[in-house]
């Protein structure tokens, strides 16, 4: 009698290897015979595709290589004809070893950076990655993990995090390892010993030393107001990655020296520069004109402090002007990392308008000189306690560096606005800012001896600087 | 790119006033830093300066012509002028209008290419 | 007016080195510039603030100045240097000189 058909085992969870033969099976009782067709994922699987074997008529559907993409719902239909289609599905897992499809290479990073080895898996079940450092399995911290992808990540890279790294992908088919690979951590060149400023008697000799360090170890260079100094008179040493180099001189006139440390990232350098002056005791430079030109302020230290759309003078007695100048704020303007939050940026304001003077619209370049006033409120009441501070040290000879010597107005020597209102210079000023906290206080709210000046907007107008300063 | 450009009388008699024109363009005559120069060149001999005006408009002169030098400007016109007096053969020269700026130590970094002027009767 | 002393003539041979000096009272305290004229054009500006080349000169243009000589260096002289030379400072008063002017001839 003709019977409708019935699956007498329905299909289950198959799971196989790739590479390995995996198998579903349909039993039909029906009479007729039925037709069992093959779906996966609910598309037809057809009797040709030369990667099944359909047996046993249509009963048995074997895949002869499995492969990770044949994963899927697998369905079989029988239908004779007699009543309904019926249908049973299951699921095909693919198994898989542990695989490193996109392991980690060697990486060179800067300190301070973000570094992150690859290490990409497949497999089934998902394996976990883990990470060896040299012998031994790698410790999470605040500043390294294993990121969902299985990379490495670590945060603010230090000099300690270099070595050889490997990662591990495991499951319960087996565990598969990366090659070795090398993280080399750069640092930026850095001036562990600053030379130190010398006054001394004409035809002394000076050594001038200057220490750095970073990874590659640096070379040093020194300049001599500008200009290159021959190797001849300088001995350097390399020592567990810092470099100690002096410099020999025969004084017969003041200079600047800088000594510059460099070192290269790849197609990159970074550069670390510190700068003494050597000075002559009794030395009277025979005066000379205003020689110079004048620029766009190029530098950095004082980018926030000059106005921006003016020139200033560039004074070509230094061989490189802008350097030499940019160098002679730099050296002040960490001595004033130091001072009170009041006389800093009223100092920094000063300093960089004395050093980088505005240049006179005039028919020949010449420099503005800051107007009396504003050098004396500066001096009198912004850092009254740090300038007495400072000119005691200078008269009894204690300051470390006599480059403030060179940075440093006589405010007496200034012109008065009062004379001609256009032969001096003002400090840059802005109209008091509640979000820029680096303010003047008001003029007006204290009663200097110095004839502050009247700022051009109204009387609760303050002085204000805001600077930004990054150098390496 | 500033350029600039002299002209005026090829041609001027003596005891007369010889006047040129100097036209500015791809920059204005009253920007700072900026100043505007009369030099020139007697035939077979070198440069020689006669004076200048500044963005502002204050003119100076070479000491040795100042009694008959005069320059002056025309800024709607962005053009410099120079008068000068009781002309003589000596005064014959090619005439030069150039820039002075003080971004190369107030050199003159720009010039016309200058206007023959004879004085002759 | 302040007094700018060049000697007339130089010669140089193709390649060598040119000097060209100019003489004046501690010159060395003051700003020297140097134009180049060939025949029949306009000065052109090769060096500035004694030393400093504007862009588009080559760097075989160099300056110095010192004491009271400036100096106009030409290193390897080519052909195409061949021309007038001629200093100029400006004085305190806002008056500028020029020096006589040296003719370089390229052997």
């Known amino acids: 009698l003709p019977k409708a058909p019935v699956i007498t085992t329905p299909l289950e969870t198959v799971d196989a290897l790739v590479e390995e033969v995996a198998t579903f099976m349909c039993a039909v009782e029906s009479y007729p015979q039925p037709e069992i067709s093959w779906t996966r994922n609910k598309i037809l699987i057809k009797l040709f595709d030369t990667r099944y074997s359909i047996r046993e008529n249509g009963q048995l559907l074997t895949i002869l290589s499995v492969e990770d993409s044949d994963d899927g719902i697998y369905c079989c239909t029988a239908n004779n004809g007699v009543g309904g289609a019926v249908e049973s599905c299951g699921a095909l897992q693919v198994k898989m070893k542990p695989k490193i499809t996109r392991p980690p290479i060697n990486v060179k990073i800067i300190e301070g950076l973000k570094a992150v080895l690859p290490c990409t898996t497949m497999g089934n079940p998902k394996p976990s990655v883990s990470w060896i450092k040299g012998d031994s399995p790698l410790r999470e911290n605040s500043r390294t993990a294993v990121l969902e992808s299985g990379s490495l990540r670590i945060h603010n890279v230090q000099k300690e995090d270099a070595g050889q790294y490997r990662c591990v992908a495991k499951n319960s088919l087996g565990t598969a390892y990366s090659k070795v690979v090398k993280l080399e951590v750069e640092v930026f060149a850095r001036i562990l010993r600053a030379p130190e400023s010398h006054n001394v008697t004409f035809g002394s000799f000076v050594t001038l030393h200057c220490t750095a360090t970073g990874i590659p170890v640096p070379t040093i260079t020194w300049i001599e107001n500008g200009n290159a100094v021959s190797s001849g008179s300088i001995q350097e040493s390399v020592k567990d990655r810092v470099i100690d180099s002096r410099l020999q001189l025969f004084i017969t006139k003041p200079g600047l020296y800088t000594c510059i440390a460099t070192n290269k990232h790849g197609e990159k350098f970074s550069t670390a520069k510190a700068a003494a002056t050597v000075s002559i005791a009794e030395w009277s430079k025979p005066q000379k004109d205003n020689k110079g030109y004048c620029a766009q302020y190029r530098g950095e230290v004082c980018n926030a402090v000059l106005a921006k759309d003016a020139l200033v003078f560039l004074n070509t007695s230094y061989a490189d002007p802008e350097e030499a100048q940019e160098l002679l704020v730099h050296t002040a303007w960490n001595e004033l990392k130091v001072v009170s939050p009041l006389c800093r940026p009223a100092a920094e304001a000063l300093l960089c308008n004395h050093v980088f003077q505005e240049c006179s619209p005039g028919v020949v370049p010449t420099p503005i000189p800051i107007c009396r006033e504003y050098c004396l409120a500066v001096k009198e009441l912004f850092c009254a306690k740090e300038w007495l501070a400072m000119e005691e040290k200078t008269h009894r000879g204690l300051y470390r560096s006599e480059m403030h010597l060179l940075s440093v107005p006589e405010c007496s020597k200034l012109p008065s606005m009062h004379w001609d209102p256009t032969a001096c210079a003002r400090l840059p000023h802005l109209d008091y800012n509640k979000e820029n906290p680096k303010t003047f206080p008001p003029m007006t709210s204290s009663k200097p001896s110095v004839d502050i000046p009247n700022l051009p907007s109204s009387s609760s107008s303050s002085f204000s600087v805001s600077p930004t300063y990054s150098m390496t | 790119q500033v350029q600039v450009q002299e002209s005026g009388p090829g041609l001027v008699k003596p005891s007369q006033t010889l006047s040129l024109t100097c036209t500015v363009s791809?920059?204005?005559?009253?920007?700072?830093?900026?100043?505007w120069s009369w030099i020139r060149q007697p035939p077979g001999k070198g440069l020689e300066w006669m004076g200048v005006?500044?963005?502002?408009?204050?003119?100076y002169y070479s000491p040795s012509l100042k009694s008959r030098t005069s320059i002056s400007r025309d800024t709607s016109k962005n053009q410099f002028s120079l008068h000068l007096s009781s002309v003589t053969p000596d005064d014959t020269a090619v005439y030069y209008c150039a820039r002075g700026s003080s971004r190369v130590a107030a050199a003159f970094d720009s010039w016309g290419q200058g206007t023959q002027v004879t004085v002759s009767s | 007016s302040y007094e700018l002393t060049q000697s007339p003539s130089v010669s140089v041979a193709l390649r060598q080195t040119a000097k060209i000096t100019c003489g004046g009272n501690?010159?060395?305290?003051?700003?020297v510039q140097w134009y180049q004229q060939k025949p029949g054009q306009a000065p052109m500006l090769v060096i500035y603030a004694d030393s400093r080349r504007p862009s588009g000169i080559p760097e075989r243009f160099t300056g110095s100045n010192s004491g009271n000589t400036a100096t106009l260096t030409i290193t390897g002289a080519q052909a195409e240097d061949e021309a007038d030379y001629y200093c100029h400072v400006w004085g305190s008063t806002a008056s500028a000189d020029f020096g006589g002017g040296t003719h370089l001839t390229v052997l």
């Open positions: 501690r010159i060395g305290g003051k700003s």
């Open positions: 005006i500044a963005y502002d408009g204050s003119t």
């Open positions: 791809g920059g204005s005559i009253t920007a700072r830093y900026y100043s």
